[in-house]
């Protein structure tokens, strides 16, 4: 079974401590080889994927993952119960909602079962690793002859998210962007009725409930304005 897990790169906001146990030996043994870094992302606080680069191992190795929460009621060591695979080799672990405790220090340990002393431990702040789902149900309302208001919904606690709105007209190549706080609405005060506008939004778990660096995917775009224009004779649906 080949499972492809798409996760953003980078883990800037994690606090990571690495502990590598090696055998005292003059020659380089397999236990001195560093284990790959584990990257965890919590998707909308519904599930968490902790993945590693399995191809960095010198030979195909089914590394095992254990986890626990530091200094908490959940400090019992747990085995991964749902591995993710890449070309039949373990490359990650998926944890379900009930196993996620955002505000306790998450400790994850990767181990080579053939060399039990070859292990690495990282400590992660999960509230900084949340990636919300893309905003949904974008709607546009005309507040006045030249003013538009964009609204959207998120499948998460609204006060925990900040947003980024981008918009452009048909002949713009670049986007104009505007940050929006937890209120999830955006007003464009001056709209040219002769132009067609495209809007899209993404969200981030920041700053009230966490300090995540990674944004959600972009929403489906929504359009406003004339269906055809003299310069750009292409038809659009109201919502892509």
């Amino acid at each position: 079974l080949n499972t492809t897990i798409l996760t953003p790169n980078g883990n800037e906001d994690t606090t990571a401590d690495f502990f590598l146990t090696t055998m005292p030996t003059d020659s380089l043994s397999v236990s001195t080889l560093p284990l790959p870094e584990v990257q965890c992302f919590v998707f909308n606080v519904e599930y968490m994927n902790c993945t590693w680069n399995s191809s960095s191992e010198p030979q195909p190795t089914n590394l095992t993952l254990h986890y626990w929460y530091k200094n908490s009621d959940n400090d019992k060591v747990q085995k991964c119960s749902h591995y993710l695979f890449s070309e039949e080799i373990t490359s990650g672990c998926q944890l379900q909602k009930k196993e996620i405790h955002l505000y306790q220090t998450f400790v994850v340990q990767l181990q080579d079962p053939r060399e039990p002393r070859r292990q690495a431990t990282q400590m992660l702040k999960l509230q900084n690793l949340v990636i919300p789902w893309a905003p949904e149900n974008l709607t546009l309302h005309k507040l006045s002859e030249s003013q538009l208001e964009l609204n959207w919904n998120n499948r998460f606690l609204n006060h925990c998210l900040e947003h980024l709105v981008q918009y452009r007209t048909d002949w713009d190549h670049s986007w104009t962007e505007q940050s929006v706080d937890y209120r999830h609405k955006f007003s464009l005060p001056s709209v040219d009725g002769q132009k067609r506008y495209t809007f899209r939004v993404r969200s981030r778990f920041n700053p009230l409930c966490g300090s995540a660096q990674h944004w959600s995917e972009w929403s489906h775009p929504i359009h406003w304005g004339s269906n055809t224009s003299k310069e750009n004779p292409f038809l659009f649906a109201l919502e892509a």
């Epitope: 798409l6 981008q166 048909d170 002949w171 713009d172 190549h173 670049s174 986007w175 104009t176 962007e177 972009w218 750009n232 292409f234 659009f236 892509a240």
Partner: antibody
Framework: QVQLVESGGGVVQPGRSLRLSCAAS????????MHWVRQAPGKGLEWVAG????????YYADSVKDRFTISRDNSKNTLFLQMNSLRAEDTAMYYC?????????????WGPGTLVTVSS | DIQLTQSPSFLSASVGDRVTITCWAS??????LAWYQQKPGKAPTLLIY???TLQSGVPSRFSGSGSGTEFTLTISSLQPEDFASYYC?????????FGGGTKVEIK
């Protein structure tokens, strides 16, 4: 890693047609706008055409309008440039380029190019 | 259409020199400008976008500045691998346009 590979170039007579392809891999092709840029021998870069991520809008340089058509097949991760009524001045190296997902949308990845020579 | 004029077209310099290339836009484009480097026989690579934002992996000796109609690309200390052609591109509106290019040669 992102990879773009153009193909379909060659020698063609004036007035004839040619179809270029650009095979994309290493990224989610259906999420990104794509472009064709050309460079005549010993000359500078010239933007030719661009297409939005879903194909809903297409844009062209005046020099190729009504002769060239940009299209894409998101199921096959492939970008196309159909070139009709070719002229000697269309002789160039043709590059496909991917937009970066930032507000400014620069071209962050380019293919190695495919050479089109229009000559009788 | 927005025209971009690059100056100079050719530039001879030595390793270690500070090099400045200028790009003028025929109308205001705010900071919607990118710079690319191209080596002979190769595809261009992105150096700078948003007039001054360094693309990931690009050495810090490259910098960009400007807004509106005048923009500059500066190489603070020219290295052997920097001898190449450089192009500006406006990213504001269609049709997209490039400057005519600047070829940086060894003196």
């Amino acid at each position: 890693q992102v990879q773009l590979v153009e193909s379909g170039g060659g020698v063609v007579q004036p007035g004839r047609s040619l179809r270029l392809s650009c095979a994309a891999s290493g990224f989610n092709f259906r999420n990104f706008g794509m472009h064709w840029v050309r460079q005549a021998p010993g000359k500078g870069l010239e933007w030719v055409a661009g297409i939005l991520y879903d194909g809903s809008s297409k844009y062209y340089a005046d020099s190729v309008k009504d002769r060239f058509t940009i299209s894409r097949d998101n199921s096959k991760n492939t970008l196309f440039l159909q070139m009709n009524s070719l002229r000697a001045e269309d002789t160039a190296m043709y590059y496909c380029a991917k937009e970066e997902d930032t507000a400014m949308v620069p071209f962050d990845s380019w293919g190695p190019g495919t050479l089109v020579t229009v000559s009788s | 259409d927005i025209q971009l004029t690059q100056s100079p077209s050719f530039l001879s310099a030595s390793v270690g020199d500070r090099v400045t290339i200028t790009c003028w836009a025929s109308q205001g484009i705010s900071s919607y400008l990118a710079w690319y480097q191209q080596k002979p026989g190769k595809a261009p690579t992105l150096l700078i976008y948003a007039a001054s934002t360094l693309q990931s992996g690009v050495p810090s000796r490259f910098s960009g500045s400007g807004s509106g109609t005048e923009f500059t690309l500066t190489i603070s200390s020219l290295q052997p691998e920097d001898f190449a052609s450089y192009y500006c591109q406006q990213l504001k509106s269609y049709p997209l346009t490039f400057g005519g290019g600047t070829k940086v040669e060894i003196k």
